[in-house]
Interface confidence: low
């Protein structure tokens, strides 16, 4: 049979010749009656055979990382019989490790981000070399890790290539860190090779920052003239920290939010100083108030950073504007009885420059020709007035400041003209009527009613009669019927139209006034042919329109 | 190894005070690393977040209580303590204090809870 | 205020088994997310913070995973200790919110 150790090569062998090891029939008597053959992949070029010993060679040199074992096939021939001395067989040569390859990180380039003050021992990433050695053979593909540059913020796990935070760190002081990583085979023992590496470590910002101004004190001016809403200036807080960790609100302390406000821009994260309420200088020309800030977005676990909020002082100057005249009321109403003479009383009205100077007001009355308004504002009739005519006037006083006409203030006056009992009352009509020759006594010929100019502060009430003469005369009567009305009614039974066709009636009617007028009215009254049904009349006035609403034939 | 306590009657009557102490040992309640909280949890349900306090005395409530709850801390005692005014029936649970870490937010140290029932 | 809502609220799963309980935000919470462990007539002890990080002392057997608003714990291989009711929590703003709980049994 065969006879054979296990064949090692060690790679990188630079000799021109290496002897493996030998094969050989354990028929071989060492007389050269056998021949030794090679066959398979590398026989012959890798891998020779000294066909007399059976000894083999490496004659190239071998990259075991390249190649680590090849299977070659024996033969054993008797060079007498040309025959096989052995059954051909299969054998491995294989070629052992030398460390001759560096560790090499294969991942490159490496980039990390880990936030700011991180506890030690975050972890902030994981670093992998690769060693082609045979892993299998002694320390060759042991790799310990190490950390060249980066102390004392990281450190590296040896084994794993794990590389966690050692020390906290602020972004605000330093950004970014490069790490250098050095990976050694042979566990780090002499002789040993090395790869490094780097490592960018990015620190992302953590709200550790509050918001700070720069300045401890504001000065600021508003114009009194100055609506609300107005911007009237900025203040500005910085913050060291980045993106929404630097995003803040400004805000004025409670006791200060009265006549301002701040509100935020958030895109320069700026306080705009805000007028809430409109300011007068000369009630109060100066105010302080005082200013927070604050971040806008911060975790709960984050506010130990944020406990005491930065404020500024805000001084505010009142600047004064020139104001027009003020009057004392928003509008006046006065009252004045009619028929009073010219130049009466009618009221004083009253307008002060509100700024300091205290210019004197000139007043005047705008669109009237009944009403004077002196230098002091008292106002008095250039007219008699009628309340019948016009009982309401709706005017427009106007005050000036004497040293700047520009200034001007107008308000309404209303003035209403108070009823005197000037006006008698008088028929509500013309009242034209007739009666019947046949007429009985006691016949309702009209009904009359009266109005009266004057206004009545009670009910208007009239009280009607007939004159002297016609009371003497005793064709008619009248009845008050206490309602404003009264009735004439016949005295007698039978009119003669021939005789006498028209009868002319004074009556008189009184108001309840103080004092009380009476006016005299006439009442025509034509005596008229009704004919025995009535229906047909003849009057001495043919187109005569009766109140009963038809012609006469 | 840092522990905590809570310490106050089981048995508090409707419409009165209910007054919890949380003893901290084995470390100071000072430390600028942790906050001090109060969490409860009614009977068979989940845990309820009442509040915290930092040592400085700056406090953190849920709205749901509605302003009834007060945290308080006295460092000299190395104690903090909660006050819930005007309870109810609903107040009926386990009151437990644990230590939250200012960087996570998380409760890494709890005392063994006390329960408190209220009822007349 | 943020909601955190747990799923499922009870299971069972035999020994040896990998068991996932999920924990959803109603908004982003970034990696402000906590999970603890409560044995009956026990008080919560904490498993996980910030995510994924492990409590000192924790079996590595428990691992948390996420970010935003949908978070995961993870125990690689049941046994019957881990018969308990885990709860997650947010420590991103207050009121810090806790999860409903699940509850994991062994079948």
């Known amino acids: 049979g065969w006879v054979w150790n296990q064949f090692f090569v060690p790679e990188e062998m630079n000799t021109t010749s290496h002897h493996i090891g030998q094969l050989r029939s354990d028929l071989d008597n060492g007389n050269n009656s056998f021949q030794y053959k090679l066959l398979g992949a590398g026989a012959g070029s890798t891998f020779i055979i000294d066909e007399r010993t059976g000894d083999i060679y490496a004659i190239q040199k071998l990259d075991r990382e390249e190649r680590s074992l090849y299977i070659l096939r024996a033969q054993v021939i008797d060079i007498a019989t040309g025959r096989a001395v052995e059954p051909e067989s299969e054998f491995v040569i294989k070629v052992s490790d030398i460390n001759d390859n560096e560790p090499k990180f294969l991942d490159e380039p490496y980039e990390a981000i880990v936030p700011e003050m991180s506890p030690e021992g975050t972890l902030v990433i994981q670093v992998t070399a690769s060693d082609a050695d045979d892993p299998s053979s002694g320390n060759n593909a042991r790799l310990l890790y190490s950390l060249l540059q980066g102390q004392p913020y990281f450190s590296v796990e040896p084994t794993t290539g794990v590389i966690r935070i050692s020390s906290k760190m602020d972004r605000e002081l330093q950004d970014e860190y490069w790490v250098i990583i050095q990976a050694k085979d042979m566990i780090g023992q002499p002789g040993a090779l090395s790869g490094t590496t780097s490592v960018l470590i990015k620190l992302s910002d953590v709200n550790d920052n509050k918001p700070i101004f720069k300045e401890s004190l504001y000065r600021l001016t508003v114009s009194e003239s100055a609506p609300t809403g107005t911007s009237i200036g900025t203040i500005m807080a910085y913050d060291n920290d980045i993106g929404e960790n630097a995003e803040m609100d400004y805000s004025i302390e409670e006791d200060d939010s009265q006549t301002f406000d701040i509100i935020t821009n958030h895109e320069t994260q700026e306080g705009i100083v805000i007028l809430k309420k409109k300011v007068d200088f000369e009630h109060q020309n100066h105010y302080g108030i005082r200013a927070k800030v604050k971040n806008h977005h911060v975790p709960e676990q984050l506010m130990k950073y944020h406990t005491e909020a930065s404020t500024t002082f805000i001084k505010i100057q009142v600047e004064d504007v020139d104001e027009p005249p003020l009057f004392l009321l928003p509008y006046y109403v006065f009252e004045v009885f009619e028929e009073t003479p010219q130049g009466s009383f009618v009221g004083v009205v009253s307008a002060t420059d509100p700024d300091n100077r205290k210019s004197p007001i000139r007043y005047s009355i705008t669109r009237s020709k009944v009403f004077n308004i002196n230098d002091n504002g008292t106002i008095t009739t250039s007219n008699s007035l009628d309340r019948e005519i016009s009982a309401w006037y709706n005017l427009s006083i106007t005050a000036t400041e004497k040293y700047n006409i520009e200034q001007i203030s107008s308000i309404p006056l209303y003035v209403q003209v108070l009823n005197i009992n000037d006006h008698a009352p008088e028929f509500s009509q013309y009242y034209e009527t007739y009666v019947c020759e046949n007429a009985g006594s006691g016949q309702v010929i009209q009904t009359i009613s009266a109005v009266d100019r004057d206004e009545s502060i009670e009910e208007h009430h009239f009280y009607f009669n007939l004159s002297v003469e016609d009371t003497n005369n005793s064709s008619f009567t009248i009845i008050d019927n206490q309602d404003n009305t009264a009735v004439i009614l016949t005295n007698r039974t039978g009119f003669n139209l021939q005789e006498e066709p028209v009868f002319y009636i004074s009556i008189l009617i009184a108001d309840n006034g103080i004092p009380s007028l009476t006016s005299t009215n006439t009442l025509t009254i034509h005596v008229c042919d009704c004919g025995d049904s009535g229906s047909t009349q003849t009057c001495q006035y043919q187109e005569l329109v009766l109140s009963m609403g038809f012609k006469t034939e | 190894q840092v522990q905590l306590q809570e310490s106050g009657p089981g048995l508090v009557k409707p419409s009165q005070t209910l007054s919890l102490t949380c003893t901290v040992s084995?470390?100071?309640?000072?430390?600028?690393?942790?906050?001090w909280s109060w969490i409860r949890q009614h009977p068979g349900k989940g845990l309820e977040w009442i509040g915290y306090?930092?040592?400085?005395?700056?406090?953190f409530y849920n709205p749901s209580l509605k302003s009834r709850g007060a945290i308080s801390v006295d460092t000299s005692k190395n104690q903090f303590s909660l006050k819930l005014t005007s309870v109810t029936a609903a107040d009926t649970a386990v009151y437990y204090c644990?230590?939250?870490?200012?960087?996570?937010?998380?409760?890494?140290?709890w005392g063994q809870g006390t329960m408190v029932t209220v009822s007349s | 205020d943020i909601q955190m809502t747990q799923s499922p609220s009870s299971l069972s799963a035999s020994v040896g088994d990998r068991v996932t309980i999920t924990c959803r935000a109603s908004?982003?919470?970034?990696?402000?997310l906590n999970w603890y462990q409560q044995k009956p007539g026990k008080a919560p002890k904490s498993l996980i913070y910030?995510?994924?990080s492990l409590q000192s002392g924790v079996p590595s057997k428990f691992s948390g995973s996420g970010s935003g608003t949908d978070f995961t714990l993870t125990i690689s291989s049941l046994q019957p200790e881990d018969i308990a009711t885990y709860y997650c929590?947010?420590?991103?703003?207050?009121?810090?919110?806790f999860g409903g709980g699940t509850k994991v049994d062994i079948k």
């Open positions: 644990a230590r939250g870490v200012y960087r996570t937010g998380a409760f890494d140290i």
């Open positions: 084995g470390g100071s309640i000072s430390s600028n690393d942790y906050y």
């Open positions: 306090i930092y040592y400085s005395g700056s406090t």
């Open positions: 908004q982003s919470i970034s990696s402000y």
């Open positions: 910030a995510a994924s």
């Open positions: 929590q947010q420590s991103y703003s207050t009121p810090q919110a």
